[in-house]
């Protein structure tokens, strides 16, 4: 079976879209008008793996660019980087396990649970224009929760 | 929790059309990536996929029997449908559904077991 | 279609034995292969995907390898509640699954 795709941008609870900031790195801001256009649109892979009650294995690509989110260890903490792979073996229905967040899609709300590690999630800051990371912590401060937008292929 | 639960008539006659309800509950399709398969079994065979529907309404068939099959679903009332046409006594098995995100499935319905006989 | 051609069909063994089932797919299927254990009157279980990751609760007794066309389900040391019957299934093509080994007290 193939992998099969969707391509999407995804929102903050705050209403921050996602944006590039240098070549390896997403910031959240809040966009107007014309400048929406400079969110990133996602290419989420829905891939094998373990699936629990209300999560989805998937791998979160930016399209038409041979980039994917992905979590390491840096300094000994699980880090969200962009990694680049090479475009010919990616997607794939086996997905190295950085690179695979468990979506957790309740009431329209998304949450993306990094696979390498468990209870770290994909989160945003409060304040504006600040990077896109991995926090390892959910209802406190920082953002964890999502809107996707579906894009048109 | 995830539960599936399958529901149909226990006997249909040959030639007759079965119509076969899958309901769910702990998850929802419209939830993107999610997917529900009908798979069947004889009593004491083997088990065979028929048919898988996804969130998008995308559909999948078994190529031996696609022309026979129709899948779909009630996103709201959290039903999953399978229609077979023509049936034959060789449709009699207990016919489950699963849940799927891909074509591994974790959870299984307690299945229902149908007799096609005149 | 992938034909999965699992053996033995049939298996007596006793409780602490290792045991070892296997199937072959008649064409490449990668890694996309599952395994499943069946009791009389009930549903599937999941044990393994990917022809060797063990699914969530499965108890570490059970491990699957192979790639390709060639697959394995180990028991390494059989407990009395795995006598059951187990089947195979890839899914690198639409579904299809073996025939199923019984596996009986010996």
């Known amino acids: 079976a193939p992998v099969r795709s969707l391509n999407c941008t995804l929102r903050d609870s705050q209403q921050k879209s996602l944006v590039m900031s240098g070549p390896y790195e997403l910031k959240a801001l809040h966009l107007q008008g014309q400048d929406m256009e400079q969110q990133v649109v996602f290419s989420m892979s829905f891939v094998q793996g373990e699936e629990s009650n209300d999560k989805i294995p998937v791998a979160l690509g930016l399209k038409e660019k041979n980039l994917y989110l992905s979590c390491v260890l840096k300094d000994d903490k699980p880090t969200l980087q962009l990694e680049s792979v090479d475009p010919k073996n990616y997607p794939k229905k086996k997905m190295e396990k950085r690179f695979v967040f468990n979506k957790i899609e309740i009431n329209n709300k998304l949450e993306f649970e990094s696979a390498q590690f468990p209870n770290w999630y994909i989160s945003t800051s409060q304040a504006e224009n600040m990077p896109v990371f991995l926090g390892g912590t959910k209802g406190g401060q920082d953002i964890t929760d999502f809107t996707m937008q579906f894009v048109s292929s | 929790q995830v539960t599936l639960k399958e529901s149909g008539p226990a006997l249909v006659k040959p030639t007759q059309t079965l119509t076969l309800t899958c309901t769910f509950s702990g998850f929802s399709l419209s939830t993107s990536g999610m997917g529900v398969s009908w798979i069947r079994q004889p009593s004491g065979k083997a088990l065979e996929w028929l048919a898988h529907i996804y969130w998008d309404d995308d559909k999948r068939y078994s190529p031996s029997l696609k022309s026979r099959l129709t899948i779909s679903k009630d996103t709201s009332s959290n039903q999953v449908f399978l229609t077979i046409t023509n049936v034959d006594p060789v449709d009699t098995a207990t016919y489950y559904c699963?849940?799927?995100?891909?074509?591994?499935?974790?959870?299984w319905g307690q299945g229902t077991l149908v007799s096609v006989s005149a | 279609d992938i034909q999965m051609t699992q053996s033995p069909s049939s298996l007596s063994a006793s409780v602490g034995d290792r045991v070892r089932i296997t199937c072959r797919a008649s064409?490449?299927?990668?890694?996309?292969v599952a395994w499943y254990q069946q009791k009389p009157g009930k549903a599937p279980k999941l044990l393994i995907y990917?022809?060797?990751t063990l699914q969530s609760g499965v108890p570490s007794r059970f491990s699957g390898s192979g790639s390709g066309t060639d697959f394995t389900l180990t028991i390494s040391s059989l407990q009395p509640e795995d006598f059951a019957t187990y089947y195979c299934?890839?899914?690198?093509?639409?579904?299809?699954f073996g025939a199923g080994t019984k596996l009986e007290l010996k």
């Open positions: 990917w022809a060797s």
């Open positions: 299934q890839q899914y690198s093509s639409y579904p299809t």
């Open positions: 699963a849940r799927s995100a891909y074509y591994s499935f974790a959870y």
């Open positions: 064409q490449d299927v990668d890694t996309d």
